[in-house]
């Protein structure tokens, strides 16, 4: 998913040349101190370096960026803008880099960024127009087509006033921008659920990853409008059933993939119609390893392997035969 | 922009099999479908299958008959397509599609099939 | 296997011309009905797909309409390097399946 280089020969910059050069215009094609550049490959490396803020004498070749393993805190709006613009920036890196804050229009000036690696930052305070770029009801189209936002979410004692996933959703429909996004990674985030309103809003997704979370239900979600998915990735989450309706759902998307893996199903008699699904359909990938983890006496049976007589609820007593 | 680069063409015996590769380069947000079609002399398109290239799972135009075989290399970006059981009505341009709607299409591969 | 009936076959226009391509599936197809340009000797490039959305690059002369069984395809103004086959294709049901094409001219 992040950006790579084929890069042969990178050109590093001392950091006492670049100091030697700082009160003067920076050279067109310079390369950044505590960074590596290679033009043939239209890359920059800035990775490891403990850096606090953005280079502002980014070479205007550069197409990949990476700014990986550093300590910039907070991304201010039009981090990246410069005169003359990036024009060619199209994959951008900034994982593991310390950000807890991405104020609104951060990526502006950026006309041709088709790929944004966030992961692995703790973002307490994401702008909802850190993609869009304003506020207004409808923005320009972003012409990010992949984002990365995997492990995100900062410690809990770091967390806002609000809901986590709420931040994240408000980030991704903020004046529609984000249209013609085709991958979406959310892994790794603890949600608890999915607001029901992001996946219409986002009809160009072609791959979703919201593995590793905590989503126990997808009763209120609807991927109807995801019209052409074709990864859907809800491995390590705490799924318990599949109920008809998103079944139904996720059968008429005619080129999807369901990756549900590591969840703990719950094979009582609400499972009858899952197992029913996943004995027909061809759209879930390695479903003859998906195994129950309740109730005890079903644990590690194969969901595949069950029959409705292998699926009974306990009848629920009456209250006046109930016991305190 | 993705760019999908098929093998050359192929002159091929009755019987015989034939497999075209098909790379893909450029553009790194490709679909994870590869579909094959065959266009024969004057004529429509066909759809011969598909893989899901990151687990290898195949649709198949039944058609074909079980002659078609598609395989996907991901260290290489490269599927394949292979005929086998060819036959004189074989002779066709073969192409390679990505996406679920075939996005982007390579450029094609003459095969003939000829004694 | 679903049918799609496409017609006309072929059809002459003149530049500037409104030109309309009609797609018939055999069953519904749920709006998965994408349409293609073969130009002679050449590959194919999908134009218009989930019956309307324009892929990405392609002039918004090109639209298509449609629900159910029946679609269709407008060119609003037809410009010399529209000369091409056109070719309606099904993604709801497998096998995908495609119509027969129609071979645009400029008179």
């Known amino acids: 998913s992040s950006p790579t280089s084929s890069a042969s020969s990178f050109s590093s910059s001392a950091p006492f040349l670049a100091s030697a050069v700082s009160a003067q215009p920076p050279l067109p094609d310079q390369c950044p101190a505590l960074c590596e550049c290679s033009e043939a490959a239209r890359t920059v490396k800035c990775v490891n370096r403990n850096l606090t803020e953005v280079p502002t004498d980014l070479p205007a070749y550069v197409r990949n960026l990476f700014l990986t393993g550093n300590q910039l805190a907070v991304l201010p709006a039009g981090a990246f803008a410069r005169r003359p613009p990036l024009a060619e920036l199209a994959a951008l890196n900034l994982s593991g880099s310390r950000l807890d804050e991405v104020r609104a229009g951060a990526f502006e000036h950026l006309p041709s960024l088709r790929q944004l690696d966030l992961s692995h930052n703790p973002l307490a305070d994401l702008s909802p127009f850190a993609f869009s770029g304003s506020n207004a009801s409808v923005s320009a189209p972003s012409p990010l087509v992949e984002l990365i936002l995997n492990h995100i979410v900062p410690p809990e004692d770091e967390r806002q006033n609000r809901s986590f996933e709420g931040m994240v959703v408000a980030a991704l429909l903020a004046g529609r921008a984000l249209q013609g996004l085709r991958r979406l990674e959310l892994a790794s985030n603890h949600f608890l659920y999915l607001p029901r309103d992001v996946l219409a809003q986002l009809p160009s997704l072609r791959h979703l990853d919201l593995s590793n979370n905590s989503l126990v239900s997808l009763t209120y979600v609807s991927f109807r409008n995801l019209t052409h998915l074709e990864s859907l990735h809800l491995e390590d989450n705490a799924l318990k059933v599949l109920h008809n309706g998103t079944l139904a759902e996720l059968q008429g998307l005619p080129h999807i993939r369901v990756f549900l893996d590591n969840n703990p199903w719950v094979c009582d008699c609400h499972m009858a119609d899952m197992v029913t699904w996943l004995k027909e359909t061809e759209v879930v990938q390695g479903k003859d390893r998906l195994t129950c983890a309740y109730p005890e006496k079903m644990r590690n049976r194969v969901l595949l392997e069950l029959n409705s007589a292998d699926l009974d609820c306990d009848p629920i007593l009456p209250p006046s035969l109930q016991t305190s | 922009e993705v760019q999908l680069v098929q093998s050359g063409a192929e002159v091929k015996k009755p019987g015989a099999t034939v497999k075209i590769s098909c790379k893909v380069s450029?553009?790194?947000?490709?679909?994870?479908?590869m579909n094959w079609v065959q266009q024969a002399p004057g004529k429509g398109l066909e759809w011969m299958g598909r893989?899901?290239?990151?687990?290898?799972?195949?649709n198949y135009n039944g058609k074909f008959k079980g002659r078609v075989t598609i395989t996907a290399d991901t260290s290489t970006d490269t599927a394949y397509m292979e005929l086998s059981s060819l036959r004189s009505e074989d002779t066709a341009v073969y192409y390679c599609?990505?996406?679920?709607?075939?996005?982007?299409w390579g450029q094609g591969t003459l095969v003939t099939v000829s004694s | 296997d679903i049918q799609m009936t496409q017609s006309p076959s072929s059809l002459s226009a003149s530049v500037g011309d409104r030109v309309t391509i009609s797609c018939r599936a055999s069953?519904?197809?749920?709006?998965?009905l994408n349409w293609y340009q073969q130009k002679p000797g050449k590959t194919v490039k999908l134009l218009i797909y989930?019956?309307?959305r324009l892929h990405s690059g392609v002039p918004s002369r090109f639209s298509g309409s449609g629900s159910g069984t029946d679609y269709t395809f407008t060119i609003s103004s037809l410009q010399p390097e529209d000369i091409a086959t056109y070719f309606c294709?099904?993604?709801?049901?497998?096998?995908?399946?495609f119509g027969g094409g129609t071979k645009l001219e400029i008179k």
């Open positions: 599609a990505t996406g679920g709607a075939m996005d982007y």
């Open positions: 450029g553009y790194a947000f490709s679909s994870s479908w």
């Open positions: 893989i899901y290239r990151e687990d290898g799972h195949t």
């Open positions: 069953q519904d197809i749920s709006n998965y």
């Open positions: 989930y019956t309307s």
């Open positions: 294709q099904q993604d709801n049901t497998l096998p995908w399946t």
